[in-house]
Amino acid sequence: LIIGFGISGKHFITVTTFTSAGNIGEDGTLSCTFEPDIKLNGIVIQWLKEGIKGLVHEFKEGKDDLSQQHEMFRGRTAVFADQVVVGNASLRLKNVQLTDAGTYTCYIRTSKGKGNANLEYKTGAFSMPEINVDYNASSESLRCEAPRWFPQPTVAWASQVDQGANFSEVSNTSFELNSENVTMKVVSVLYNVTINNTYSCMIENDIAKATGDIKVTDSEVKRRSQLQLLNSG
């Protein structure tokens, strides 16, 4: 969370950004909010990126002005125009690329004053894991798969019954490069599992952490998975 203040004569406004993460090959959002101003025509939003000449995006007088936009962002950016009056200056970025990572500045000017705040935008790949029982194995085992991760994550197993146990000796993890030669498929197999226990497969890199849980009983298999972005305010 970064809060910036701006001073314009006696006036300053608070601009707030959150460290954001973009999943490459998807649309992303760079979050920025400011003190609302009901006079839409008096609001100017400028997004800049460190090391890039020209603007990432500009919105003023109630509409986009792309006249000074850098070619790298042409056709890819948008603000949420209907939410600007309530103080939302967040930027939508189409088809996030690894090269979009960096430090961005959200600069705001309204009739109340001006202000800006920086934002660290991280890019990578992260996806939900899916755990299945591997009945083909010689002993009962679990297979945890997640289709897209970058940078290479760590994988760890845990169980509800054997809390604190180290499963590295009874698991095998592999990383298979996907066809675009950047992201990787994560596959981890846990051997010698017992029924009536809940196992968790945790995949984590510096951008995201994902957990898949599976509970195997005599009568059913229950699954749950969740994903959280790290350092996002």
Epitope: G25, D27, D64, G75, T77, S127, S179
Partner: antibody, heavy 116, light 109 residues
Framework: QVQLVESGGVLVKPGGSLRLSCAAS????????MSWIRQAPGMGLEWVSY????????YYTDSVKGRFTISRDSAKNSLYLQMNSLRAEDTAVYYC?????????WGQGTLVTVSS | EIVLTQSPGTLSLFPGERATLSCRAS???????LAWYQQKPGQSPRLLIY???SRATGIPDRFSGSGSGTDFTLTISRLEPEDFAVYYC??????????FGQGTKLEIK
């Protein structure tokens, strides 16, 4: 050079199924958002379905939800549209298109006719 | 749901004249996500303009795009015989994800 070639369009009876293919060359399919767009005879363009570069996000227009499935095979650099429970109103030329900045490349289209 | 309305439905002009085609959105569209296409009979559509005002590769400079918010315009400064076709505007990012206008037919007078 960039090329998209659709195939699979035929005459099919209402309620039938069909799988359209789109073979891409000159670029890597998984670097771009890809869509299927259709055009009924004498009518305008209608977006049908989309798959993100990552392959993780998929959308459909309301009229085909639950009936059509978009997919891709990165190894074959191909895009597919599985069409089930076909209706007369699905009759159209189906195009696959690459979304670079706008739909910058289109296939030649394949005609799907749904009629008894 | 966002609706793009193109006008006029049909535009009849002489070669050499200036053509102005309009695309109006039912709600605000990001300029970045607004494109124009040309389609000739029996052919696939061709991207003319992206990001509201940027010409696509190989498009002659007689084609220009402008506008923002809800009102966008495609202008052909001096019509050539090959310009007579159907023109579509298209947006990305709202619901539905992609939307096309119904088209404007540009015909020879």
């Amino acid at each position: 050079q960039v090329q998209l070639v659709e195939s699979g369009g035929v005459l099919v009876k209402p309620g039938g199924s069909l799988r359209l293919s789109c073979a891409a060359s000159g670029f890597t399919l998984s670097d771009y958002y890809m869509s299927w767009i259709r055009q009924a005879p004498g009518m305008g363009l209608e977006w049908v379905s989309y798959i993100s570069s990552s392959g993780s996000t998929i959308y459909y227009t309301d009229s085909v939800k639950g009936r059509f499935t978009i997919s891709r095979d990165s190894a074959k650099n191909s895009l597919y549209l599985q069409m089930n429970s076909l209706r007369a109103e699905d009759t159209a030329v189906y195009y696959c298109a690459r979304d670079g900045v706008g739909f910058d490349y289109w296939g030649q289209g394949t005609l799907v006719t749904v009629s008894s | 749901e966002i609706v793009l309305t193109q006008s006029p439905g049909t535009l009849s002009l002489f070669p050499g004249e200036r053509a102005t085609l309009s695309c109006r959105a039912s709600q605000s569209v990001s300029s970045s996500y607004l494109a124009w296409y040309q389609q000739k009979p029996g052919q696939s559509p061709r991207l003319l303009i992206y990001a509201a005002s940027s010409r696509a590769t190989g498009i002659p400079d007689r084609f220009s795009g402008s506008g923002s918010g809800t009102d966008f315009t495609l202008t052909i400064s001096r019509l050539e015989p090959e310009d007579f076709a159907v023109y579509y505007c298209q947006q990305y990012g709202s619901s539905p994800l992609y939307t096309f206008g119904q088209g404007t037919k540009l015909e020879i007078k």
